[in-house]
Interface confidence: low
């Protein structure tokens, strides 16, 4: 016996059973893994008085203690609809079905005399049907429904007389059913029987407050189990060759402070006082845990040496229950001031260490949904996915001997103290219906798929490809707004006067009259932070640099009456100095952010983008920039992520749609101006960049979620793409969806009606498609009332906790970018596409492994889109060059310009032009390839300012 569970929290360096990798494990379960599903008789059978069944303590408890619950008589009626249960089992494809026998259905008053024939027939028919279907029965003898007569006559489990009566009942079951049953469970979760039945009074028989009674009941349950095990072991195992255990339930707990010895001690005590209470005598040394014996000496019964010997080892495997009943209500739990956790993997590790690595059957696992949830139980899928992934990690990474898994439960039914207010079934049952049809929920479809694949297959993404991007591919890095230096940092050559320093007197400079020196023209090197920019860019080895101008700096008044020439000179310097390094600029004219709209003050005060005249002001500003920088800049972005301005103009949907309308017009005016006035001489290209995350249905088994995913793309991307790339008008699907909500009185929003002139103005005003893509969102349909953009969409987002995510909870889902590119091409035709921003936040200041993983995986998917899907992808701009202080860490450089290791990774991808085959020698000609200029780099680094 080992008893070393506390090591799980110490995380001592020599012991790391839990692999700390965040990555979800795509793998299969062992070949003969035992997949099952369970129910409890009282929860699903119904018919509490039918065919001679006697009342149980729960039938009585319901009538006396539970308000608003008439009986379990409604329930799912499994006693009547046996065939429907069998069909449900067939549907899922389980290897075993765990169910319990209702003791009072076989023996109405609990005493083993002549069994109730109808009850016997029911269980016999069920077992025969299971065997016929090759479904292994796992039979629980006692799942809380003690015959009421035994409670009233003997005081129930408080009286050790029950031990022998229970053994008689078990003997009968072994005799009648043992030929068809290879797995037996004596008692389901004895902790709850004792603690809630006699301590809190929340369970039948509803006694409370007597701690001595609680531990007496626990003692008798353990002894009853042990007696039955020995009975089976001696008299039935030799010819029936089955296995027998007891299902023990528990929570899991984490210390407040992982380094604190006292907190770890409390966590160990918490586990020991719940799971150890029963596991120690049965799976451990035969006695109660030492901590319990010391603390509860006045109320905890004592095992004699002979009894300890008798208790020890009375289970053929460890049957473990991990579900809501051990977690709620929280105020009755042995939390010891620590943090309750749903980490099943760690609980399994604790069992492994504490009880010497037993074979484990997860005999109950699952969560619950609100009773109003019918078949679309989306959160249940994710709870199951999380639990199953933890079990798989425990098996594969921690070498824990889990041999089977019981999903709980087959059917919606009576949920103990929660009665019918929650649902735990994988099949939905309408309790008010006559036929009690079993309708598969999404979780049933999901579990079925897991069983069919024996785990998690990596279906979402195709294998990595080897190949290269074209020679003219833009390898970029994106920066947000560059604030221009208002004064050049080196004015020493621009002042023609000579000065003498009065060093000994007043220490001032005195101008020498009559002397004029030669000045030199202003130089780009006068700006200090340009040097920093260039240093960083040179290290990135990119071919393109995307940055944004600050509209408010260039035109402080919002019109051309006051042009900040110094700001324009600064931006021209950034572009021209970059070109000397072989780095072309993609310039964004307007880059609003959450905190700052970036508009010139006068425009901001005149209602910003709610005012149509802002679009005209933008056109004038764009014209100035084209004129001043267009000879050097060949790629322009008018507005960055106008589809995200909804975050700012969110007082009402109509504000949002009005602002969006003016942004579209602003872009179109700028594009038309460039097309008419500047394109002939400058030959550049103009677009706007849209925030373009992909969307997947949170629940792939719910058609409403598929529609919500498409609707997300309509409201997020098509909202701007459709008018510009395609029709000149908003997407019909979006317009109709908002209108339909309007008609039903759920929203007062309406998309603006475009005139024919406006449609003509907007249509076709893009030279390429620019997308900012960061992640994939999991969306679900939820009807929302209200007149804001967010509620107009009827969409909620779901965070999948099993996925690799960043500190800001951006999920790393590489295949989403490929799906996005294909969707764009399918909807808007074959055009040049640039990914103008793509990246992830990573806490690491040096070895940013998450960013390297992200870049590698996302670029793989972009390459697949290029090579396999033939998408005309022209460039990828990683986001972003340098991080900003106290903002999420998206940068390749820290805010004080320290380089991170992802730079070298990106360098390597750029120099290879992707992921070429070994020994691939597909080089580009010198004219095509931007070769790095070593002298330029040297000059950039050494040039004195």
């Amino acid at each position: 016996f080992s008893g070393d569970g506390r090591a799980i929290w110490s995380k001592n360096p020599n012991f790391t059973p839990v692999n700390e990798s965040q990555l979800f494990l795509y793998d299969t379960f062992p070949k003969n893994f035992f997949w099952g599903i369970g129910t409890g008789a009282l929860q699903v059978e119904g018919s509490w008085k039918k065919d001679g069944k006697g009342p149980s303590i729960w039938d009585h408890f319901i009538h006396t203690h539970l308000k608003n619950v008439s009986s379990t008589n409604g329930s799912s009626d499994s006693y009547i609809f046996l065939e429907k249960d069998l069909s449900a089992l067939d549907f899922i494809g389980v290897s075993f079905y765990q169910f319990s026998i209702s003791w009072p259905r076989l023996f109405p008053d609990g005493i083993v005399t002549v069994a109730n024939a109808k009850g016997l027939q029911y269980y016999s028919t069920l077992l025969d049907a299971l065997v016929l279907r090759n479904i292994e029965p796992i039979v629980t003898l006692y799942h809380w429904d003690l015959p009421l007569a035994l409670q009233e006559k003997y005081g129930g489990w408080k009286n050790d007389t029950i031990i022998d009566i229970f053994n008689d009942y078990a003997t009968y079951c072994f005799q009648m059913f043992g030929d068809r049953v290879k797995y037996w469970i004596t008692i389901h979760n004895p902790y709850l029987v004792a603690w809630h039945g006699y301590g809190t009074g929340m369970h039948a028989p509803g006694e409370k407050g007597n701690l001595a009674a609680v531990y007496t009941v626990g003692h008798n349950l353990i002894k009853a189990h042990s007696k039955v095990w020995h009975n089976y072991n001696t008299h039935f195992r030799p010819h029936q060759k089955g296995w027998l255990s007891i299902t023990l339930g528990s929570h899991w707990i984490e210390p407040n402070r992982s380094e604190n010895t006292m907190d770890i001690f409390k966590c160990q005590q918490s586990m020991v006082s719940v799971l150890g209470w029963f596991a120690n005598p049965i799976h451990g040394d035969g006695d109660y845990p030492e901590g319990m014996r010391k603390k509860l000496f006045s109320v905890l019964p004592i095992f004699s040496e002979a009894e300890k010997h008798e208790m020890r080892g009375t289970a053929d495997f460890f049957a473990f229950s991990f579900g809501p009943n051990n977690f709620k209500p929280l105020n009755t739990m042995a939390k010891m001031g620590q943090n309750v956790s749903l980490n099943l993997r760690e609980a399994l590790n604790w069992i492994k260490l504490e009880y010497n690595n037993p074979r484990i059957l997860i005999a109950e696992n699952g969560w619950f949904t609100d009773s109003r949830v019918k078949t679309e139980d989306t959160t249940a899928i994710y709870m199951m996915k999380n639990f199953l992934s933890q079990v798989l990690q425990a098996i594969r990474l921690d070498e824990i001997r889990v041999f089977g898994y019981t999903a709980w439960s087959l059917l919606d039914g009576f949920e103990w103290q929660d009665a019918y207010t929650i649902r735990r079934g994988l099949f939905y049952v309408d309790f008010n219906s006559k036929q009690k049809e079993r309708k598969p929920k999404s979780s049933a479809h999901y579990y079925k798929q897991i069983i069919r694949e024996n785990g998690f297959s990596l279906k979402e993404s195709t294998p990595d490809v080897q190949g290269q991007f074209p020679c003219d591919f833009s390898w970029g890095v994106t920066e947000s707004v560059l604030k221009p230096e208002s004064v050049a940092s080196s004015p020493q050559f621009s002042d023609p006067h000579l000065y003498v320093w009065n060093a000994t007197g007043n220490r001032l400079l005195h101008r020498v009259e009559g002397v004029r020196l030669k000045t030199r023209p202003a130089q780009c090197t006068d700006f200090v932070n340009i040097k920093k920019q260039l240093e960083m860019l040179a290290r990135m080895k990119v071919t393109h640099y995307r940055f944004a101008l600050d509209w408010a700096s260039v035109l402080p008044t919002g019109n051309l009456s006051a042009v900040n020439r110094q700001a324009l000179r600064y931006y021209r310097c950034v572009v021209s100095e970059g070109l000397k390094l072989g780095i072309s600029a993609m310039v964004t004219l307007y880059y609003p952010t959450h905190a700052h709209l970036g508009l010139p003050e006068p425009l901001l005060h005149a209602d910003g983008w709610l005012n149509p005249s802002t679009a005209e002001a933008f056109q004038a500003y764009a014209g100035l920039c084209f004129q001043e920088l267009g000879d050097l800049v060949k790629l322009w972005i008018t507005i960055n992520e106008p589809n995200r301005l909804s975050d700012i103009y969110n007082r009402s949907g109509n504000d949002t749609y009005g602002a969006a309308h003016n942004l579209l017009v602003a872009h179109a005016l700028a594009w038309r101006l460039y097309d008419r006035q500047f394109r002939p001489s400058q030959r550049g290209a103009v677009s706007l960049s849209l925030h373009a995350d992909w969307a997947e249905p949170a629940n792939p088994y719910a058609d409403s979620h598929w529609r919500a995913a498409e609707r997300f793309l309509q409201f997020e991307i098509a909202w701007f793409a459709e008018p510009l790339f395609k029709t000149g008008d908003y997407p019909a699907a979006m317009r109709e969806y908002i209108a339909s909500k309007h008609r039903r009185g759920l929203s007062s929003s309406a998309l603006p009606r475009l005139t024919e002139a406006e449609r003509r103005l907007l249509k076709g005003t893009v030279d390429f498609c620019a997308l900012n893509h960061f992640t994939t969102r999991f969306v679900m349909h939820e009807q929302l009332a209200g007149s804001r953009y967010d509620s107009d969409r009827d969409i909620q987002f779901l965070q999948d906790i099993t996925r690799l995510s960043s500190p800001t909870r951006l999920a790393v889902i590489p295949w989403g970018v490929r799906k996005l590119l294909r969707w764009v091409r399918r909807n808007y035709g074959d055009m040049d596409i640039y990914i103008t921003a793509s990246g992830i936040d990573d806490q690491a200041l040096e070895d940013d492994r998450l960013r390297k993983y992200y870049l590698g995986k996302y670029l793989q998917e972009v390459l697949k889109a290029y090579l396999i899907d033939k998408v005309r992808i022209k460039g990828y701009y990683a986001f972003k060059l340098a991080e900003e202080k106290s903002k999420p860490r998206f940068g390749f450089f820290t805010s004080d310009f320290k380089a991170k290791s992802s730079i070298q990774f990106y360098n390597k991808v750029i120099s290879s032009r992707g992921f070429p085959f070994e020994n691939s020698s597909s080089r580009c000609s010198q004219t095509q390839e931007n070769t790095e200029c070593t002298v330029c780099l040297f000059l950039v680094q050494k040039k004195p300012l």
Partner: antibody
């Protein structure tokens, strides 16, 4: 381009078994969201659904004809086969196969592509 | 099993609006799909999920569904719209496809 094409005998004698084949192209029968239905239409009458096969090989049959129908698929040949036993003159009809897009298991988006139909006459 | 009831025929003048109904017990909670079938041709899906139009189907075709009635509306009817129209649902209880009896749309004149 997605197409479905029905093939089978033009004439069947009473009590014989009818075997119809639907050959599909432009999509895979393995695709998790695709299913195929058989529908028939007696001359001058309404459409009558017969059977459906899902991507995971689950099948569903019209209650009134269940005992006579079998639907199956051969993914490698891109074919769905319907057999109907004990044919009778009232089974004279045009038989269509149609693709159904099924999101997430059991939610029809309707039958978006149909074959041109094959006319079967039952007569001695 | 689930039954869908359609009127046998509907007549409408060119340029007017035709409404074809499909009745069923609480049909509003089901998804309804509509098909157009011209003589000698296979049916064509014109509306799915109550009101969505497949690509290539004119905007004149629209659908609605609530209570016990689903409706296919064809505005600005043209002579080429003359055909049989069928409604269809997927009955989740029985896992069956159910068609209505069909409605013959006649364009007058």
């Amino acid at each position: 381009q997605v197409t479905l094409k029905e093939s089978g005998p033009v004439l069947v004698k009473p009590t014989e078994t009818l075997t119809l084949t639907c050959t599909v192209s432009g999509f895979s029968l393995n695709n998790a969201r695709m299913g195929v239905s058989w529908i028939r239409q007696p001359p001058g009458k309404a459409l009558e659904w017969l059977a459906h096969i899902f991507s995971n090989d689950e099948k569903s049959y019209s209650t009134s004809l269940k005992s006579r129908l079998t639907i199956s698929k051969d993914t490698s040949k891109s074919q769905v086969v319907l057999t109907m036993t004990n044919m009778d003159p009232v089974d004279t009809a045009t038989y269509y196969c149609a693709r159904s897009v099924v999101t997430g298991g059991y939610y029809y988006e309707g039958m978006d592509v149909w074959g041109q139909g094959t006319t079967v006459t039952v007569s001695s | 099993s689930y039954v869908l009831t359609q009127p046998p025929s509907v007549s409408v003048a060119p340029g007017q609006t035709a409404r074809i109904t499909c009745g069923g017990n609480n049909i509003g909670s089901e998804s309804v799909h509509w098909y157009q079938q011209k003589p000698g041709q296979a049916p064509v899906l014109v509306v799915y999920y109550d009101s969505d139009r497949p690509s290539g189907i004119p905007e004149r075709f629209s659908g609605s569904n609530s209570g016990n009635t689903a409706t296919l509306t064809i505005s600005r009817v043209e002579a080429g719209d003359e055909a049989d129209y069928y409604c269809q649902v997927w009955d989740g209880n029985s896992d069956h496809v159910v068609f209505g009896g069909g409605t013959k749309l006649t364009v007058l004149g």
